[in-house]
Structure formats: structure tokens, C-alpha cells
């Protein structure tokens, strides 16, 4: 019976040309993690293995940095990262495991206070 | 430099039976789970059956299951298929791959033909 | 199962030429597709892991892309050693499938 939980930072944001974090958390069970894929819809970008170790998809290499720990660091970032990534646990002997994170890149905050601040 | 060498093939009876081994070098073998994929003579890639690495759980294509055994060596680096009660069908080029992250085959060894006839 | 449907089965092409052949998957596989090349008498090589990554050493002229059920290899230009049968090959779910392959030809 699978009894874990999966913990993640649920929705966050981010400015755009800045860095952020992804970080899942497996927690309520005991199973062995075997693999963490991280995905961005329906595209791999890194995925981390017990044995081989860390593996990032080479369109992404220049942006993604693995970790800390089995989350993934996303770089220079654009507005087009935004959107829904998602880690995918393998653990043995529970199964598979999946956590959602919704991403929204923002604009600069001095372009957001520009804007906040104009006389209407 | 990753190598993969089968061995075992040949000819054997309907009904008969046949242990191929891929002898592994190269990488650390224990680390990566294994998989074997046939090819008939003419046809297409047909895969047999998978072994993971941390777990040891296997697979097998419906038409191999409860005849063929995928197993491994890791103390030897050797990967097994034990094929009983075999049929004409079974008759291919057997490869034995290399399947880093579950996800994709990026070694093959040179393969081993079983061609099985009367 | 999950089914893998290629097209063309075969294809004619002269050096230079860009080529597509596509794949399409029975149900969504996400981005769990890889392509390889194979030529007579030799084993399978890998092209394209998890949709549209390049495997190392593989020349540029190679590419993939797609997702759920659609996918498309592509070949910018078309070199003499590329003569060869493409297959794609789904690693979603267990069985494995491997679509019927597509065989390019010199025109």
C-alpha cells in the first residue's frame, strides 16, 4: 500500500532573469527513492538517480542545476518558464509518486513598481 | 569504453532450451538497469524482457512470459536470458542493451542468433 | 499495450534532402520516446532519448521533437550514411513497443 506524501513548495514565483528552487519532499513512508524525474509539461529536464546520479536534458544544461538534495535549481529565468513542473518519484517497493509545483515568472520588480506607481 | 558481448546462441528443437549471457565492461555495470530486445529475421525490434538495477524487479513481453528469465551477475557483470520451451517464433537475433534512467537503450551488443527448428 | 505507428514504412531521398518520419503512440506517452538507427547486419544505435534529446556524438543534422501521442525525427540534410532504418520506441510503460520502422532509401 503506498502511504507516502509528497510535500512541494506549490505555487511560486519568481523574477524574470533570477533563479529559483524546486524542492519535493517524500515523506510517510519508508520506501527506497530509486529515481526523481523532474518534468515541465510533458518534457524531461533532469532526472536523478540513486545509482547513476544526476542526468540534465541537454537543451537544458545551460539553465539547470541539479539540487539541492533531489530538487533542481532553474536559472535565467524567462517568461516562458512559466507553468506547471512536476517531480515524479520512483520508490521501491511503493511505486511512483507525483508532485505538482506551478511556476510564475514575473517581470523585475523595478518594472512592477514603475508600473504600480504611475499616475493614473 | 562501454562494451556488451552476447554469447549462447545457435540452434536448438521446438521445445528446447537455450541460456544467453551479455558479458558487460566499460561502465559499472550494477548501477544500470538491463534490458533484452530480439529481432526476427527481416522484421522489426521486439522487446523480451528488462531487469532493474536497486531493485532487481523484472519484466517480460506477453509472448516470453513463464518460459524466458532475464537475470544478472553483478559480481560477474553478466546478464542472463534462460529461454525454455521454445518455438519457431522465438527464432531472432537476440540483442542485450544498456537502459540508463529507464528511459531510453544507448548501448546495444552486436547480438546472438537463435534460430529454433526442427 | 501501447502501439507505435510509424510512417512512411519506407521513403526514397536524395543526399541533401530533409526528412521527417513520424511516430504516433496509441495513448499519451509523454515525452517517453527515443529513436534509433539501424543498418543491415548491425545493432540498433541510438539518435533521440525523451522526445527530442540528442544523444551524444550524434550529428546535429539529427532532431526530434513532440509530445503525448505525436513525435517527428528529423534529418536537416540528408548524408550518404544515413541510408538506414529508423525506429522509434516507446519506454512509458512496460511492454516496451517499438514502432514497425521506417526504411530510408537512396532516390
Known amino acids: 500500500m503506498m502511504t507516502g506524501t509528497i510535500e512541494t513548495t506549490g505555487n511560486i514565483s519568481a523574477e524574470k532573469g533570477g533563479s529559483i528552487i524546486l524542492q519535493c519532499h517524500l515523506s510517510s513512508t519508508t520506501a527506497q527513492v530509486t529515481q526523481v524525474n523532474w518534468e515541465q509539461q510533458d518534457q524531461l529536464l533532469a532526472i536523478c538517480n540513486a545509482d547513476l546520479g544526476w542526468h540534465i536534458s541537454p537543451s537544458f544544461k545551460d539553465r539547470v542545476a541539479p539540487g539541492p538534495g533531489l530538487g533542481l535549481t532553474l536559472q535565467s529565468l524567462t517568461v516562458n518558464d512559466t507553468g506547471e513542473y512536476f517531480c515524479i518519484y520512483h520508490t521501491y517497493p511503493d511505486g511512483t509518486y507525483t508532485g505538482r509545483i506551478f511556476l510564475e515568472v514575473l517581470e523585475s520588480s523595478v518594472a512592477e513598481h514603475g508600473a504600480r506607481f504611475q499616475i493614473p | 569504453e562501454v562494451q556488451l558481448l552476447e554469447s549462447g546462441g545457435g540452434l536448438v528443437q521446438p521445445g528446447g532450451s537455450l541460456r544467453l549471457s551479455c558479458a558487460a565492461s566499460?561502465?559499472?555495470?550494477?548501477?544500470?538497469?538491463m534490458s533484452w530486445v530480439r529481432q526476427a529475421p527481416g522484421k522489426g525490434l521486439e522487446w523480451v524482457a528488462s531487469?532493474?538495477?536497486?531493485?532487481?524487479?523484472?519484466y517480460y513481453a506477453d509472448s516470453v512470459k513463464g518460459r524466458f528469465t532475464i537475470s544478472r551477475d553483478n559480481s560477474k557483470n553478466t546478464l542472463y536470458l534462460q529461454m525454455n520451451s521454445l518455438r519457431a517464433e522465438d527464432t531472432a537475433v537476440y540483442y542485450c542493451?544498456?537502459?540508463?534512467?529507464?528511459?531510453?537503450?544507448?548501448?546495444w551488443g552486436q547480438g546472438t542468433l537463435v534460430t529454433v527448428s526442427s | 499495450d501501447i502501439q507505435m505507428t510509424q510512417s512512411p514504412s519506407s521513403l526514397s531521398a536524395s543526399v541533401g534532402d530533409r526528412v521527417t518520419i513520424t511516430c504516433r503512440a496509441s495513448?499519451?506517452?509523454?515525452?517517453?520516446l527515443n529513436w534509433y538507427q539501424q543498418k543491415p547486419g548491425k545493432a540498433p544505435k541510438l539518435l533521440i532519448y525523451a522526445a527530442s534529446s540528442l544523444q551524444s556524438g550524434v550529428p546535429s543534422r539529427f532532431s526530434g521533437s513532440g509530445s503525448g501521442t505525436d513525435f517527428t525525427l528529423t534529418i536537416s540534410s540528408l548524408q550518404p550514411e544515413d541510408f538506414a532504418t529508423y525506429y522509434c520506441q516507446q519506454s512509458y510503460s512496460t511492454p516496451l513497443t517499438f514502432g514497425g520502422g521506417t526504411k530510408v532509401e537512396i532516390k
Open positions: 495513448q499519451s506517452i509523454s515525452y517517453y
Open positions: 531487469i532493474k538495477s536497486s531493485t532487481g524487479y523484472t
Open positions: 566499460g561502465f559499472t555495470f550494477s548501477s544500470y538497469a
Open positions: 542493451a544498456r537502459v540508463p534512467y529507464g528511459v531510453w537503450i544507448d548501448y
